[in-house]
Amino acid sequence: TLNSVLNSNAIKNLPPPLGGAAGHPGSAVSAAPGILYPGGNKYQTIDNYQPYPCAEDEECGTDEYCASPTRGGDAGVQICLACRKRRKRCMRHAMCCPGNYCKNGICVSSDQNHFRGEIEETITESFGNDHSTLDGYSRRTTLSSKMYHTKGQEGSVCLRSSDCASGLCCARHFWSKICKPVLKEGQVCTKHRRKGSHGLEIFQRCYCGEGLSCRIQKDHHQASNSSRLHTCQRH
């Protein structure tokens, strides 16, 4: 049954508009991962590639960010653009390619010895307990290599999956992003036809765990294209 494969990332209570509160993004919003309201193009294929429209960085791939394609362009028209490499200009962390962050308007290399999240001025307080902070890279301080930041546990706010503990990923949850469990075998997953094409999901599931891939559930082959249930299955 459907319930047997739902997991902690799956939708138990339908989100807006079915769940009693309203979501108003810049364009189409899905009622559940994999279900898109008219007007969206979540299932854009690579073969017929067009610039992928987006409202936020997390709707793009890991090597992309969301922005207007022209400098000073119409803010209402945004697409996924290739991330910026080291030493390129930036305005926020998501513009920089993985392994880099935006410091003083330039993409610079992350210190791999430390937690990838941002560190507040209150360094000792932040490192003294479990609450992962993700603030102000511009105030980043060089710390003893022994001082590691606790990675986010399930339900913690995050910016990227590297902010989360092992077995968790950073996924949209309404207007925030939180650490959620990577999916296990048999759990419902969301199949994206193009790398990073997360659509405008109100909240996202994580990806399938190691050795698993998101495939149509065997008994759902007869179902229509839009209603096929995908689950994490062994390769």
Epitope: G19, E56, H131
Partner: antibody, heavy 115, light 108 residues
Framework: QVQLVESGGGLVQPGGSLRLSCAAS????????MTWVRQAPGKGLEWVSG????????YYADSVKGRFTISRDNSKNTLYLQMNSLRAEDTAVYYC????????WGQGTLVTVSS | DIVLTQSPATLSLSPGERATLSCRAS???????LAWYQQKPGQAPRLLIY???NRATGVPARFSGSGSGTDFTLTISSLEPEDFAVYYC?????????FGQGTKVEIN
């Protein structure tokens, strides 16, 4: 350190409007979703609205839907709540807070709706 | 909507005693998307616990959270004078976000 400062509260007649502001500092504002929560005098906490880091996604409690509008200006590190068609039951202290679980809160601003 | 019911409504204890506050959800939360807050008169709430069991920045170790599904608990191992306040639980599993009605911890 993280600081949130609300302003814009006051006395307004039923049917009137108010715009609340929340000035944020001490963190990278556009990295975070923001939330408005209210508390009627002597009562508990009630979630009002939420907005994503870029402002593209907004959510509202049924009790304020169609009357309140949440927005943000990331260039000014400021969160807003435009409140129209105010009712007596909207009387409360309004707090802005960071993220979906509210890890930092402002001091609150009192909105009184009365004739 | 998910209704959170806190009990007891009031807890009368002395400094040094252990406080156990309960928060029960009307539906299974499935994930540990529950937070606890402390509020003192005339002040804004303060986050204590998020993700059901993670202590927030600057929160003393005497505060701990536990539970899953529908039953969650906030424990204060040894009450300090500054701990006497109202405590709220909040779920962020689904919309609308909801809070419990609060538990007042008062000096006996």
């Amino acid at each position: 350190q993280v600081q949130l400062v609300e302003s814009g509260g006051g006395l307004v007649q039923p049917g009137g409007s108010l715009r609340l502001s929340c000035a944020a500092s001490g963190f990278t504002f556009n990295n975070y979703g923001m939330t408005w929560v209210r508390q009627a005098p002597g009562k508990g906490l009630e979630w009002v609205s939420g907005i994503s880091g870029s402002g593209s996604y907004t959510y509202y409690a049924d009790s304020v839907k169609g009357r309140f509008t949440i927005s943000r200006d990331n260039s000014k590190n400021t969160l807003y709540l435009q409140m129209n068609s105010l009712r007596a039951e909207d009387t409360a202290v309004y707090y802005c807070a960071r993220t979906i679980y509210m890890d930092y809160w402002g001091q609150g601003t009192l909105v009184t709706v009365s004739s | 909507d998910i209704v959170l019911t806190q009990s007891p409504a009031t807890l009368s204890l002395s400094p040094g005693e252990r406080a156990t506050l309960s928060c029960r959800a009307s539906q299974n939360l499935f994930s540990p998307y529950l937070a606890w807050y402390q509020q003192k008169p005339g002040q804004a709430p303060r986050l204590l616990i998020y993700g059901a069991s993670n202590r927030a920045t600057g929160v003393p170790a005497r505060f701990s959270g536990s539970g899953s599904g529908t039953d969650f608990t906030l424990t204060i191992s040894s009450l300090e004078p500054e701990d006497f306040a109202v405590y709220y639980c909040q779920q962020y599993m689904t919309l609308p976000l909801t809070f419990g009605q609060g538990t007042k911890v008062e000096i006996n």
